[in-house]
Amino acid sequence: SERCDDWGLDTMRQIQVFEDEPARIKCPLFEHFLKFNYSTAHSAGLTLIWYWTRQDRDLEEPINFRLPENRISKEKDVLWFRPTLLNDTGNYTCMLRNTTYCSKVAFPLEVVQKDSCFNSPMKLPVHKLYIEYGIQRITCPNVDGYFPSSVKPTITWYMGCYKIQNFNNVIPEGMNLSFLIALISNNGNYTCVVTYPENGRTFHLTRTLTVKVVGSPKNAVPPVIHSPNDHVVYEKEPGEELLIPCTVYFSFLMDSRNEVWWTIDGKKPDDITIDVTINESISHSRTEDETRTQILSIKKVTSEDLKRSYVCHARSAKGEVAKAAKVKQKVPAPRYTVELACGFGAT
């Protein structure tokens, strides 16, 4: 056969689906690799072909579209399972071709089992809700295209193992779950089960996501430098180790980059000749506020180093701040013998 543009195995799209549930999988060629859509390709006389490699096998084989009740079917650029079975796990390939053109891509499909409390190896999307920030909602994800708009499915929401009914601040509203006010106690896994009829059969779609309650933008402040501060003086003798921690608190801000850095005499430590090491540690509060500590260390400080300006800087989407550390050279203790000698001077 003629050459085919092979995009390889697209592991970025590790598709996971639940066993015994419908799954619709779009050929990734049109979503991520080609600059035209399926309709354009189809009207240009290109044909979409599907095949697969079973788990732990090397042999590519055609997909059987003649199973009872059309369990696996293709519709335009979508491969349908109604429903999936555990042994559907494998690498699936969609190939677009005619006599002069060929392009294909493979992707892994994993059929996953879940227990009665919806626990499974499925990677869960995380939805962040602001703490005490009015009404916020999550929407049952990835259910578009499974049934026409004329079909009215039933949707049941669960928190962990428990059906959400008469919860204090969590209200099921069809495809949405409303949090009247989000609290730390709302952290957890939420599952929607969508039940719909099709050709005399009943199908279920299970979707689980993790809710994480984070700091509210109404409480967000610019970075706060706790250390260095005006109360602590770093007093060292030449030859001693100088350790200065820069500890900065950052309010949680969605999609904000938090930065901490030191300057020595106005320059980044990398741009000066002295032997400085900087170690960083990060900790988070329950609402994902962040505390970053960067410890500046000079193993054997010189008297020149003790004259330099050490400034800790911090930046977030809320603003930028800086604070200088108070560094000074220890004044040597007066030498007792000299003072005695002076005291007994001749009169």
Partner: antibody, heavy 121, light 110 residues
Framework: QEQLVESGGGLVQPEGSLTLTCTAS?????????MCWVRQAPGKGLEWIGC?????????YYANWAKGRLSISRSTSLSTVTLQMTSLTAADTATYFC????????????WGPGTLVTVSS | DVVMTQTPASVSEPVGGTVTIKCQAS??????LSWYQQKPGQPPKLLIY???NLASGVPSRFKGSGSGTEFTLTISDLESADAATYYC????????????FGGGTEVVVK
């Protein structure tokens, strides 16, 4: 029986200020509810002003036109919600309703009878 | 804030007839739409919530439909007691939405 009653309406001079109070009875403010203010000028339609969360966290929603001049607050212990209005004009002449929502897609299921505010010299 | 546009402003139909009121949101509000009935000197009364759910005690002659930006209230088998003004309201509370009402539709039953 769950009930809302508005009070504090009456005649007020232009540029004056007024505070309306909505008193709830028959249900606990410490439960999670949102209390809203809606007004209706004589012979005109309903106009949403804003809502406040009744629990022990301050959160309010306001219509864009109401921000700055109208302010909603609440007292959980007194089971009251207040609407403070400043720089009143004749356009603020209306019946002011207090209403409550919780579930059922945030629909306003419980309403007070309303209190009339007339701004005139 | 979202803007709710309600049509028609007024409609007159005979007893037993059907009235259709439309409400359009300036941006998608999913199913977060309520319909209210108001009679002179009274506060509004909830009829429909979540675009299509009937509030308790409301006769099934009242039917709500739609989602996103287009919504409809249909009153069939009109009765004289249905003479009132009807309002739609966006209930998708959010910092960008609010709870705006439509301008109202006066229903006259002949």
């Amino acid at each position: 029986q769950e009930q809302l009653v508005e009070s504090g309406g009456g005649l007020v001079q232009p540029e004056g200020s007024l505070t309306l109070t909505c008193t709830a009875s028959g249900f606990s403010f410490s439960s999670i509810y949102y209390m809203c203010w809606v007004r209706q000028a004589p012979g005109k339609g309903l106009e949403w002003i804003g809502c406040i969360y009744t629990g022990n966290s301050d959160f309010t929603y306001y219509a864009n036109w109401a921000k700055g001049r109208l302010s909603i607050s609440r007292s959980t212990s007194l089971s009251t919600v207040t609407l403070q209005m400043t720089s009143l004009t004749a356009a603020d002449t209306a019946t002011y309703f207090c209403a409550r929502f919780r579930d059922d897609y945030a629909s306003l299921k419980l309403w007070g009878p309303g209190t009339l505010v007339t701004v005139s010299s | 804030d979202v803007v709710m546009t309600q049509t028609p402003a007024s409609v007159s139909e005979p007893v037993g007839g059907t009235v259709t009121i439309k409400c359009q949101a300036s941006q998608s509000i999913s199913s977060y739409l309520s319909w209210y009935q108001q009679k002179p000197g009274q506060p509004p009364k909830l009829l429909i919530y979540g675009a299509s759910n009937l509030a308790s005690g409301v006769p099934s002659r009242f039917k709500g439909s739609g989602s996103g930006t287009e919504f409809t209230l249909t009153i069939s088998d009109l009765e004289s007691a249905d003479a009132a003004t009807y309002y739609c309201q966006c209930t998708y509370y959010d910092n960008n939405y609010g709870g705006a009402f439509g301008g109202g539709t006066e229903v006259v039953v002949k």
